[in-house]
C-alpha cells in the first residue's frame, strides 16, 4: 500500500513485496527491497527497542536508491507495519507483516510486564485493548478480573481486529482491576499480557474553603483551615496552598479523602493547612488548588492578624436615630475587634433582653417602634479575651405623625342647638409638635352623602371644596382660638379651637395637622337642629353598672310624637371621619326604644332610662320630634358613652427614701381607676392621722411630714380602694440625724 | 504579566527524542495546571497532555500515550513534555497553556517539532 | 472521542457588521451540573490562542463586549458585533465535557 501525497515527479518508493498484508511463519527470514528515486529509509516496528540488532538494513547492489530490509529468524513480536519513505518526505510504501507465531499469537509490548488501558465510565465511550495480534484471524476474547468475565466479540460493539486489538465499551469492564486478551489455537490457550485498567475522571465541582470569610487571630493562635475538594468518581487530587509565609516553619499540611455516602456520585477530598503560632507576616491572601491533572479549582480566603485582642467601635456608628411610629428600627452595632466583642445593650441604664417585640444582638431591632421606645440606648462592646469595654451611647428619638386624641370619640352626628355658641376642639398629639393646625369648614348640604357621590374606603368625603374658616361667608361667624399646649394623660398636647359664635348654619368642619412625619385631620358634624334638646342626668358619662338617663325635651306646641331611638350598624361601616346618611332621612338603622313621657307647662320630655349600664349600652340615640304643623321630622343625636370598671393603680414617686431631721418629705401617691378610688395613708401597718405635721392634701393624694422627726421613720403605705378592689405602694422612710431635745421644738404624733 | 514561553523544538528524525520545556513567569506556577497543545501545519489544535498542580496525576491523548511523558518542576516554575520515538506526524507547533476550571486561559508562543529523516 | 464541527470559513463580513460563527458537537456539552462545556478561542495571524467564551456564552477576563456564546447541548454560536480588523483569525471551538479534550477544525474571519 502507498501512503503520502504524490509530488510533481517523484513516484511512491517500490517494494519488492507488491502486497498489502505479508504472513510468514516463524523463524523464516522476511527480507524486503525497497526502490526509489531519492534516499530512502525503513521504519518497522518496536524499532526503538532492542530488537534492532536483528535487523538488518543495506544498499543493494544493484542500484542507487535502493535498500534492503532483512529480519533473520521472525518472531511472533516482529509482526506489524514495516514503512519504506523517502528522507524528509510523507511519500511511503507499506506493508503489514504478520509472523504467525502459534505459541506466542500476541504481539508482546515494548515493555513485556504489563499495559495500561485508561477508561472512563461514559456508557458511549469504547476502549481499545492493544493486544495485536501475529495472526489475522484469532479467536480472541477478553478476560476481566475480579471477578473474572469473558467478553467475546459479537459483531457490533465488541470486536477484536490484529491490528488495533480489542475494543469494547468502557464501562463494561469499570469494574476491573486487569485485563488480557486470549486466543484459542487448536485447544491451546494463548494469553496476552496484563493490562491494568484505571478508570479516569477529572471533573471537580467545587473548592470550598472553611472558615471562608471573615478569619481574624490574634499573634501566636493557632490557624486552621480545611480545603474540601467535591469531583466525580474516580478522580486523584493534588492540593497545593499558596500564603503570605509559604516558608512557615510551623505548618503542617495534611491531605485526605472523606468518606462519602455509597451510592453517592461524588467524592470528596480534604486538604488541611495548619499554622500553630501564627504571626503578623502571615496575615494575608490564603488559596488553595485542588488539581485533579485536566481541571484546576481554586479558592482563596483573607486572614487578619491582630497584634492583641482589641475591641472598638467603627466610624459608621449612629449616635442619634430617628423613626416614626410603627417602622422597623435597626441600630447596628458597628464595631472593630478581634475576637468578636460580647454585646449588651441597656435602655436609660437597664439590660435589653431580646423577646417578640425586640432583638437586642449584633444589631438592635426594635420591631414596630413606638413612642415609649424613646430613650438613651447603651451598647456595651466587651472583648471576651482581655475583657476590655467600650460603650456607646445612642439617642433614638421616635416622632408621631399628628394624632387627633377626640377622633377616636367621635360619634357620626352630634346636634346642635339653634342660635347658641358652640367650641370645637381638636386636641392634637405628635411628635415633633405639628407645626400648624388648619381649620376649614363646608356647608352640610354641599357635602351629603348623596347616591351619586361614591364614598370609598380611601375617600370617605365626597366633598372636596373645603374652605378656609377665615373665609366664614355663608356660614357660621368663626373664630380660633390660639393653640394652647396642655399635659394631658401625661403627654404634652396642642389643642386648638374654633369657636362658633352662633350656631345659624349645619356645616362640616376639618382640623388639619403636619409635623414632619405626616398628618392627621378629624371632621366635625356640625348639625344645627331648631328641634329638641337631649340633656344628660346626671350630667356626667356613666360607669357600669351605674343608671343614667337620657332626657328628650321639645317644645309642646311646636312639635309631637316624641320617640326615643338607638342608632343602629350603618350600612356602610363608618371610618374615622366619614359622613353617615342623615339619620332621620333613613329610619331603617334606628331601634326604637321603650321611654316615658313627663309634661310641664310648655315642654313635652320623653325620659329613656338605663338602669345597670353596660358597655353594649354605648352608642348614639336619637330622640326624633315630628313637627305638627308641617310633619317634618327632627332628629337629635347624642353620643353615650359609658366608662369601664377599672380595678384602682397607683402610679407616684413613692420610693424608699433617706432625710435628714428636721427636714420635709414631699410625697405624691396618684391613683387611676374607675370609679375613682378613695386613697388612704398608714404608717407601718396603721392608719396615718392628719396633724400640724401631717398634711394630707388633693384628695389624700399629696402626703407633706414637716419637719420630720426620728419617730416618722418607718414604712409608709398608700393604699387606694373602691368597690372594684385595692392597690397598694409602699417606701420605707429613714431619718438622719440627731434628735435635738428643745421645748419649743413641736411635736407631732401619730398611730 | 503572565508569561509562558516554550524552548527545546527542533527537527528531529523520526523514531527520535526530544524533551520541550516550558518557562512560566507572573504568576504562581504550583498553582494551576499546565497543558501541552499542538497546532499541525494544517491548523488544527490538538491537546497533547496535561498534569495537575503537583504533578501527581497526569493525562494523555491517545496518540501520543506510552510515548510522551509530561512533567513539571514546580521550584524551578517549568513544564517539560518528554517525547520518544516522534513520528511524523508529531510535527506541529507545540505550545503550552496554563489551565484553570479545565479552561486553557493563557498560551505560550509555541516552538515547533519537525519530526522528518 | 467527541467530535467537534466548524465551517472552514465564515459568512464574509464587512468592517462594523455583525457576523456568527457556529459550531457543532456530536455529542450534548450540557453537563448533569447544569453547566454546558464548550469555550471559545482567538487565534489572531502570527499569535497564540487566547480564551474568549467559557461555558458557552461567559466572557473571560478582558474580552470585549462585543463577543457573545450562545447555543444549544449541541450546536453553538459566537456572534461578534460591530466587527473590527483585529477580531480578523482563526475562532476554534473546544469541548470540555468529555475526556479527551477536542478542539474544531477552526472557522476562518473572512472580510468582504
Known amino acids: 500500500a502507498s501512503v503520502g501525497l504524490p509530488s510533481v515527479s517523484l513516484d511512491l518508493p517500490r517494494l519488492s513485496i507488491q502486497k498489502d498484508i505479508l504472513t510468514i511463519k516463524a523463524n523464516t527470514t522476511l527480507q524486503i527491497t525497497c526502490r526509489g528515486q531519492r534516499d530512502l529509509d525503513w521504519l518497522w516496528p518496536n524499532n526503538q527497542s532492542g530488537s534492532e540488532q536483528r535487523v538488518e538494513v543495506t544498499e543493494c547492489s544493484d542500484g542507487l536508491f535502493c535498500k534492503t530490509l532483512t529480519i533473520p529468524k521472525v518472531i511472533g513480536n516482529d509482526t506489524g507495519a514495516y514503512k519504506c519513505f523517502y528522507r524528509e518526505t510523507d511519500l511511503a510504501s507499506v506493508i503489514y507483516v504478520y509472523v504467525q507465531d502459534y505459541r506466542s499469537p500476541f504481539i508482546a509490548s515494548v515493555s513485556d510486564q504489563h499495559g495500561v488501558v485508561y477508561i472512563t465510565e461514559n456508557k458511549n465511550k469504547t476502549v481499545v485493548i492493544p493486544c495485536l495480534g501475529s495472526i489475522s484471524n484469532l479467536n480472541v476474547s477478553l478476560c476481566a478480573r475480579y471477578p473474572e468475565k469473558r467478553f467475546v466479540p459479537d459483531g457490533n460493539r465488541i470486536s477484536w481486529d490484529s491490528k488495533k486489538g480489542f475494543t469494547i465499551p468502557s464501562y463494561m469492564i469499570s469494574y476491573a482491576g486487569m485485563v488480557f486478551c486470549e486466543a484459542k489455537i487448536n485447544d491451546e490457550s494463548y494469553q496476552s499480557i496484563m493490562y491494568i485498567v484505571v478508570v479516569v475522571g477529572y471533573r471537580i465541582y467545587d473548592v470550598v474553603l472553611s472558615p471562608s470569610h471573615g478569619i481574624e487571630l490574634s499573634v501566636g493562635e493557632k490557624l486552621v483551615l480545611n480545603c474540601t475538594a467535591r469531583t466525580e468518581l474516580n478522580v486523584g487530587i493534588d492540593f497545593n496552598w499558596e500564603y503570605p509565609s509559604s516558608k512557615h516553619q510551623h505548618k503542617k499540611l495534611v491531605n485526605r479523602d472523606l468518606k462519602t455516602q455509597s451510592g453517592s456520585e461524588m467524592k470528596k477530598f480534604l486538604s488541611t493547612l495548619t499554622i500553630d503560632g501564627i504571626t503578623r507576616s502571615d496575615q494575608g491572601l490564603y488559596t488553595c488548588a485542588a488539581s485533579s491533572g485536566l481541571m484546576t479549582k481554586k479558592n482563596s480566603t483573607f486572614v487578619r492578624v491582630h497584634e492583641k485582642p482589641f475591641v472598638a467601635f467603627g466610624s459608621g456608628m449612629e449616635s442619634l436615630v430617628e423613626a416614626t411610629v410603627g417602622e422597623r428600627v435597626r441600630i447596628p452595632a458597628k464595631y472593630l475587634g478581634y475576637p468578636p466583642p460580647e454585646i449588651k445593650w441597656y435602655k436609660n441604664g437597664i439590660p435589653l433582653e431580646s423577646n417578640h417585640t425586640i432583638k437586642a444582638g449584633h444589631v438592635l431591632t426594635i420591631m414596630e417602634v413606638s413612642e415609649r421606645d424613646t430613650g438613651n440606648y447603651t451598647v456595651i462592646l466587651t472583648n471576651p479575651i482581655s475583657k476590655e469595654k467600650q460603650s456607646h451611647v445612642v439617642s433614638l428619638v421616635v416622632y408621631v405623625p399628628p394624632q387627633i386624641g377626640e377622633k377616636s370619640l367621635i360619634s357620626p352626628v352630634d346636634s346642635y342647638q339653634y342660635g347658641t355658641t358652640q367650641t370645637l376642639t381638636c386636641t392634637v398629639y405628635a411628635i415633633p409638635p405639628p407645626h400648624h393646625i388648619h381649620w376649614y369648614w363646608q356647608l352640610e348640604e354641599e357635602c351629603a352623602n348623596e347616591p351619586s357621590h361614591a364614598v370609598s374606603v380611601t375617600n370617605p368625603y365626597p366633598c372636596e371644596e373645603w374652605r378656609s374658616v377665615e373665609d366664614f361667608q355663608g356660614g357660621n361667624k368663626i373664630e380660633v382660638n390660639k393653640n394652647q399646649f396642655a399635659l394631658i394623660e401625661g403627654k404634652n398636647k396642642t389643642v386648638s379651637t374654633l369657636v362658633i359664635q352662633a350656631a345659624n348654619v349645619s356645616a362640616l368642619y376639618k382640623c388639619e395637622a403636619v409635623n414632619k412625619v405626616g398628618r392627621g385631620e378629624r371632621v366635625i358634624s356640625f348639625h344645627v337642629t331648631r328641634g329638641p334638646e337631649i340633656t344628660l342626668q346626671p350630667d356626667m358619662q356613666p360607669t357600669e353598672q351605674e343608671s343614667v338617663s337620657l332626657w328628650c325635651t321639645a317644645d309642646r306646641s311646636t312639635f309631637e310624637n316624641l320617640t326615643w331611638y338607638k342608632l343602629g350598624p350603618q350600612p356602610l361601616p363608618i371610618h374615622v371621619g366619614e359622613l353617615p346618611t342623615p339619620v332621620c332621612k333613613n329610619l331603617d338603622t334606628l331601634w326604637k326604644l321603650n321611654a316615658t313621657m313627663f309634661s310641664n307647662s310648655t315642654n313635652d320630655i320623653l325620659i329613656m332610662e338605663l338602669k345597670n349600664a353596660s358597655l353594649q349600652d354605648q352608642g348614639d340615640y336619637v330622640c326624633l320630634a315630628q313637627d305638627r304643623k308641617t310633619k317634618k321630622r327632627h332628629c337629635v343625636v347624642r353620643q353615650l358613652t359609658v366608662l369601664e370598671r377599672v380595678a384602682p393603680t397607683i402610679t407616684g414617686n413613692l420610693e424608699n427614701q433617706t432625710t435628714s431631721i428636721g427636714e420635709s418629705i414631699e410625697v405624691s401617691c396618684t391613683a387611676s381607676g374607675n370609679p375613682p378610688p378613695q386613697i388612704m395613708w398608714f404608717k407601718d401597718n396603721e392608719t396615718l392621722v392628719e396633724d400640724s405635721g401631717i398634711v394630707l392634701k388633693d384628695g389624700n393624694r399629696n402626703l407633706t411630714i414637716r419637719r420630720v422627726r426620728k419617730e416618722d421613720e418607718g414604712l409608709y403605705t398608700c393604699q387606694a380602694c373602691s368597690v372594684l378592689g385595692c392597690a397598694k405602694v409602699e417606701a420605707f422612710f429613714i431619718i438622719e440625724g440627731a434628735q435635738e431635745k428643745t421645748n419649743l421644738e413641736h411635736h407631732h404624733h401619730h398611730h | 504579566e503572565v508569561q509562558l514561553v516554550e524552548s527545546g523544538g527542533d527537527l528531529v528524525k523520526p523514531g527520535g527524542s526530544l524533551k520541550l520545556s516550558c518557562a512560566a513567569s507572573?504568576?504562581?506556577?504550583?498553582?494551576?495546571?499546565m497543558s501541552w497543545v499542538r497546532q499541525t501545519p494544517d491548523k488544527r489544535l490538538e491537546w497533547v497532555a496535561s498534569?495537575?498542580?503537583?504533578?501527581?496525576?497526569?493525562y494523555y491523548a491517545d496518540s501520543v500515550e506510552g510515548r510522551f511523558t509530561i512533567s513539571r518542576e514546580n521550584a524551578k516554575n517549568t513544564l517539560f513534555l518528554q517525547m520518544n520515538s516522534l513520528k511524523s506526524e508529531d510535527t506541529a507547533l507545540y505550545y503550552c497553556a496554563r489551565e484553570m476550571d479545565g479552561n486553557y486561559d493563557y498560551w505560550g508562543h509555541g516552538t515547533t517539532l519537525t519530526v522528518s529523516s | 472521542d467527541v467530535m467537534i464541527t466548524q465551517d472552514e470559513l465564515s459568512n464574509p463580513v464587512t468592517f462594523g457588521e455583525s457576523v456568527s460563527i457556529s459550531c457543532r458537537s456530536s455529542?450534548?456539552?450540557?453537563?448533569?451540573?447544569?453547566?454546558?462545556?464548550l469555550n471559545w478561542f482567538l487565534q489572531r495571524p502570527g499569535q497564540s490562542p487566547q480564551l474568549l467564551i467559557y461555558l458557552m456564552s461567559t466572557r473571560a477576563s478582558g474580552v470585549s463586549d462585543r463577543f457573545s456564546g450562545s447555543g444549544s447541548g449541541t450546536d453553538f454560536t459566537l456572534e461578534i458585533s460591530r466587527v473590527k480588523a483585529e477580531d480578523v483569525g482563526i475562532y476554534y471551538c473546544q469541548q470540555l465535557v468529555e475526556y479527551p479534550f477536542t478542539f474544531g477544525s477552526g472557522t476562518k474571519l473572512e472580510i468582504k
Open positions: 507572573g504568576f504562581t506556577f504550583s498553582m494551576y495546571g
Open positions: 498534569i495537575s498542580i503537583g504533578g501527581s496525576y497526569t
Open positions: 455529542k450534548s456539552l450540557l453537563y448533569k451540573d447544569g453547566k454546558t462545556y
